[in-house]
């Protein structure tokens, strides 16, 4: 593999459909600009869930309509994905790219299997 990226094997989303996991990378150098992308792999299809580019020491900024939020600390990125439903259960891969300064390094994790269980609807109270 290229750059080493580690992430937990399994995470269970909470009852509100929120899942959090840490994506950690082993930086070969002193990167100042890092790009983190979350990919969802279902069957053989891979789709981008969200992406953020951040300067080391600064906050991650996802697009306003993104379902992801996150914080960074050193070579760790704490990612939170919101609004998940049971149908979103799948393998979520963390991709890290060291964009600046050169050289460019990239790596992908083995993926975090996120399980989402839709809450049971509340029974009607008489």
């Amino acid at each position: 593999k290229a750059m080493h990226v580690a992430q937990p094997a399994v995470v269970l989303a909470n009852s509100r459909g929120t899942a959090s996991f840490v994506c950690e990378y082993a930086s070969p150098g002193k990167a100042t600009e890092v790009r983190v992308t979350v990919l969802r792999q279902a069957d053989s299809q891979v789709t981008e869930v969200c992406a953020a580019t951040y300067m080391m020491g600064n906050e991650l900024t996802f697009l306003d309509d993104s379902i992801c939020t996150g914080t960074s600390s050193g070579n760790q990125v704490n990612l939170t994905i919101q609004g998940l439903r049971a149908m979103d259960t799948g393998l979520y891969i963390c991709k890290v790219e060291l964009m600046y300064p050169p050289p460019y390094y990239m790596g992908i994790g083995n993926g975090t299997q996120i399980y989402v269980i839709d809450p049971e609807p509340c029974p009607d109270s008489d």
Epitope: A2, P28, P103, Y105, M106, I108
Partner: antibody, heavy 115, light 107 residues
Framework: EVKLDETGGGLVQPGRPIKLSCVAS????????MNWVRQSPEKGLEWVAQ??????????YYSDSVKGRFTISRDDSKSSVYLQMNNLRTKDMGIYYC??????WGQGTLVTVSA | DIQMTQSPPSLSASVGETVTITCGAS??????LNWYQRKQGKSPQLLIY???NLADGMSSRFSGSGSGRQYSLKISRLHPDDVATYYC?????????FGGGTKLEIK
Amino acid sequence: EVKLDETGGGLVQPGRPIKLSCVASGFTFSDNWMNWVRQSPEKGLEWVAQIRNKPYNYETYYSDSVKGRFTISRDDSKSSVYLQMNNLRTKDMGIYYCTGGFTYWGQGTLVTVSA
Amino acid sequence: DIQMTQSPPSLSASVGETVTITCGASENIYGGLNWYQRKQGKSPQLLIYGATNLADGMSSRFSGSGSGRQYSLKISRLHPDDVATYYCQNVLNTPYTFGGGTKLEIK
């Protein structure tokens, strides 16, 4: 200014060894995974070997075509990377480039294998 | 090992035209793809890294796109100076395989 200067190429007989050297300047050598890439008319560009840096315990990787015959090494104190090539074959002929990551490239040194 | 298939092997176009070179990987490389330009008698130069990012000092007429297994390099408003051989390369995994190259000529 970034510079990568390869030396050590030349004419060598099949089965004989040769050692290539590359001295780098103008960038942070210790932050780079260093590679050797070769170019031949038959095969175009071909990645040969990589040595990673201290955070990666100087791990080494080789293409199948050179595994067991070539050895890559580095000396961070001299900003240098080396390629020891043993048991050379005619198909090893070509221009050998030293690269920092894959961003910085040297001018190359020509290795000719012939009896 | 990941195989990289580049097409076309050669290409002839007129100054001012737009040309596209494609590169296919034998498996998903997650955007881990570089493009290089090699001019006659010169060393290869990094052109695009991470599938879409333009390397320092390269003309914005070059752009990269693609994901998964399929990638392309577009050269807009072709210049005589663009005559070169272009290579794609997998940078996700070792061995870091290159495509076979595309030789670009001007009509």
